[in-house]
């Protein structure tokens, strides 16, 4: 439905508070280096303009598109060329090319300082002094570091952030109340950001059809009692929402997400029995709750899939007449019967089915040709099952830290060209699959593990895309979205890799390691492990374990010493010499 003024329409729909928050997120996600104050100024100007359009939709410039209005505003930033270099060239373009240009310059790994958490009293004072600025700053800092963060969900995080401070700054023990909440928000936020990044990568790199297929599979698992037509409607609407958010159209995205939540709650009887509690919550909580809702129970007595998709004489007729609808129905029917499968496995099965029909529906004997298609699914199902079983056994045997180390070694040997910080970050996250998923019963392990691994491997893909260094990573990342994990799993040691020159500086440690948190100390050790493997890719597990054990003992010893720095200097030299000897460097 056309509106005379798009900006007025969105302002009225969303309300001033959400409007301002979303514009701030949008601007911070585009101009990630700009100071907070500059963004606030731009947002205030846009908001004032929007109010004039609400008052009179025919006022000057009110008929302009949001991209035009926002792009024009961003292009007024004085330091654009100095701060962003070639991104400034976007401003010479017309819409829609200008917005596309801004999108292409979003940086998944911006050169920004790590967010250091101030003392609790300092934070509480800042919160009380100026609550609005304090919360805006949160939105700004998260948005600029996570340029694809799902904007309406970030509003939900901000609401929880505010609630945490409101409650805990009045508590007797502020820190005990606040810090766990902030840790939880941080961890959930990182996970949310990574999940959304995969959705955007799916849309941008593989197209709408790939995203829709993912959505059909996931929603069919979640709402197995819903009819195919209902699931299709939800998929269409959800695709629109995510296309908008991934495209920087955050006002439209938030508005459409609210409409979708409203529709789902109005039609919950025909969607899922699990929505009741979600639908009683306020908007932001409601949308979040729906997105995380547990799978509904499968309808009883679902017939065999073979009847419609193998045995029917109309398989090829139905497929040829509406390929995507027929494949969508197959995916829906398979997914609603298999909440125990990962979405990516379901998509692999659908792809196999599609490939078989493409072949067999042009064959002289189509039925004989596709009669055994379901037999082809068996190895596809068994591969992730076996992999998860093996890795969960390894996780249970080693614990998270050592399991991460095993993965660090494995992945460094596969793709040693990748930067050490990226290998550490990705392998640590891959390793978290153990504590996240191995505790689940068999029926929940695969959807938990493999779909989580898809999210983590996407992080590797987007970081690698920024600075490509490995053809193998590029190949696994670009050939097939659903086969990324099997592609990486299948990689063996890269025999073409020329070992890195030994540099003693890489293995020189100082007393500051003693004051680091356990997590930071692990990262230091894991960084050293990656560097070791890069120097000696053919080192055995036993050799690496011996060196790492010596290293752990060395850190522990020197951190207990009276003169820590001297200990690190002297014992460090000995450790490096011993390690070189042990590894034959």
């Amino acid at each position: 439905d056309a509106h005379k003024s798009e900006v007025a329409h969105r302002f009225k729909d969303l309300g001033e508070e959400n409007f301002k928050a979303l514009v701030l997120i949008a601007f911070a996600q585009y101009l990630q280096q700009c100071p907070f104050e500059d963004h606030v100024k731009l947002v205030n100007e846009v908001t004032e303009f929007a109010k004039t359009c609400v008052a009179d939709e025919s006022a000057e410039n009110c008929d302009k598109s949001l991209h035009t209005l926002f792009g024009d505003k961003l292009c007024t930033v004085a330091t654009l060329r100095e701060t962003y270099g070639e991104m400034a060239d976007c401003c010479a373009k017309q819409e829609p090319e200008r917005n596309e240009c801004f999108l292409q310059h979003k940086d998944d790994n911006p050169n920004l300082p790590r967010l250091v958490r101030p003392e609790v009293d300092v934070m509480c004072t800042a919160f009380h002094d100026n609550e609005e600025t304090f919360l805006k700053k949160y939105l700004y800092e998260i948005a600029r570091r996570h340029p694809y963060f799902y904007a309406p969900e970030l509003l939900f995080f901000a609401k929880r952030y505010k609630a945490a401070f409101t409650e805990c700054c009045q508590a007797a023990d502020k820190a005990a109340c606040l810090l766990p909440k902030l840790d939880e928000l941080r961890d959930e936020g990182k996970a949310s950001s990574a999940k959304q990044r995969l959705k955007c990568a799916s849309l941008q790199k593989f197209g709408e059809r790939a995203f829709k297929a993912w959505a059909v599979a996931r929603l069919s698992q979640r709402f197995p009692k819903a009819e195919f037509a209902e699931v299709s409607k939800l998929v269409t609407d959800l695709t629109k929402v995510h296309t908008e958010c991934c495209h920087g159209d955050l006002l439209e995205c938030a508005d459409d997400r609210a409409d979708l939540a409203k529709y789902i709650c109005e039609n919950q009887d025909s969607i899922s029995s699990k929505l009741k509690e979600c639908c009683e919550k306020p908007l932001l909580e409601k949308s979040h709750c729906i997105a995380e809702v547990e799978n509904d129970e499968m309808p009883a007595d679902l017939p065999s899939l073979a009847a419609d998709f193998v045995e029917s004489k109309d398989v090829c007729k139905n497929y040829a007449e509406a390929k995507d609808v027929f494949l969508g129905m197959f995916l829906y029917e398979y997914a609603r019967r298999h909440p125990d499968y990962s979405v990516v496995l379901l998509l692999r099965l659908a792809k196999t089915y599609e490939t078989t029909l493409e072949k067999c529906c042009a064959a002289a004997d189509p039925h004989e040709c596709y009669a055994k298609v379901f037999d082809e699914f068996k190895p596809l199902v068994e591969e992730p099952q076996n992999l998860i079983k093996q890795n969960c056994e390894l996780f249970e045997q080693l614990g998270e830290y050592k399991f991460q180390n095993a993965l660090l070694v494995r992945y460094t040997k596969k793709v040693p060209q990748v930067s050490t910080p990226t290998l550490v970050e990705v392998s640590r996250n891959l390793g978290k699959v153990g504590s996240k998923c191995c505790k689940h019963p068999e029926a929940k392990r695969m959807p938990c593990a493999e779909d989580y691994l898809s999210v983590v491997l996407n992080q590797l893909c987007v970081l690698h895309e920024k600075t490509p260094v490995s053809d193998r990573v590029t190949k696994c990342c670009t050939e097939s979205l659903v086969n990324r994990r099997p592609c990486f799993s299948a990689l063996e040691v890269d025999e073409t890799y020329v070992p890195k020159e030994f540099n003693a500086e890489t293995f020189t440690f100082h007393a500051d390691i003693c004051t680091l948190s356990e997590k930071e100390r692990q990262i230091k050790k894991q960084t050293a492990l990656v560097e070791l493997v890069k120097h000696k890719p053919k080192a055995t597990k036993e050799q690496l374990k011996a060196v790492m054990d010596d290293f752990a003992a060395f850190v522990e010893k020197c951190c207990k010493a009276d003169d820590k720095e001297t200990c690190f200097a002297e014992e460090g030299k000995k450790l490096v010499a011993a390690s070189q000897a042990a590894l034959g460097l």
Epitope: K317, A364, E368
Partner: antibody
């Protein structure tokens, strides 16, 4: 653009064998059935069989089992048909044709004339 | 195997005249395709999946039918339509062709 280029005319002795080729270009050769069709002078069309180069699967018209052997090579994107124990009845034009969904043949080669004569 | 009987075997039509030829199957088929062949050349796909016109085929041509009875119709004959037309069934192995209808210009 899609092209199917067949090998030249053949004149062979009865009892011998011949292998004719069909070089495909302009499309994903592995993903389409290649069919072979026989046409005798002044007569209709007769389907011999087909191959799916992606995995080598074949279907034959029962009348040509033992007479025709269809193969394909993915690297020069070429399909072949070998005809054995040739008689004058095998003298005909043989045409390769790409098969598509629901079994129609959308592109045809120019035909290879086979003459079996002593 | 399914036998396809085309009729008439030969027919002639004047320019502007409506032309209909039929293809009867010995048992039900899923889809029928039609090919045009002019002397000295390979056949060309003309109508496929019973009723769809192949690329470049004039809209005066149409195809219809189901089960065992199919037809090709030319709304208004033109000189360039003179050729032999073959039907071909899909859905039963082996694939089979009709003997052809030769359409001549009167």
């Amino acid at each position: 653009q899609v092209q199917l280029q067949q090998s030249g005319a053949e004149l062979v002795r009865p009892g011998s064998s011949v292998k004719i080729s069909c070089k495909a270009s302009g499309y994903a050769f592995s993903n389409y059935w290649m069919n072979w069709v026989k046409q005798r002078p002044g007569q209709g069309l007769e389907w011999i069989g087909q191959i799916y180069p992606g995995d080598g699967d074949t279907y034959y018209n029962g009348r040509f089992k033992g007479k025709a052997t269809i193969t394909a090579d993915k690297s020069p994107t070429t399909a072949y048909m070998q005809l054995s124990s040739l008689t004058s009845e095998d003298s005909a034009v043989y045409v390769c044709a790409r098969g598509v969904i629901l079994g129609s043949f959308d592109y045809w080669g120019q035909g290879t004339t086979l003459t079996v004569s002593s | 195997q399914i036998v396809l009987t085309q009729s008439p075997a030969i027919m002639s039509a004047s320019p502007g005249e409506k032309v209909t030829m039929t293809c009867s199957a010995s048992s039900s088929v899923s889809y029928m395709h039609w090919y045009q062949q002019k002397s000295g050349t390979s056949p060309k796909r003309w109508i496929y999946d019973t009723s769809k016109l192949a690329s470049g085929v004039p809209v005066r041509f149409s195809g219809s039918g189901s089960g065992t009875s199919y037809s090709l119709t030319i709304r208004s004959m033109e000189a360039e339509d003179a050729a032999t037309y073959y039907c071909q069934q899909w859905g039963s192995n082996p694939l089979t062709f009709g003997a052809g209808t030769k359409l001549e210009l009167k």
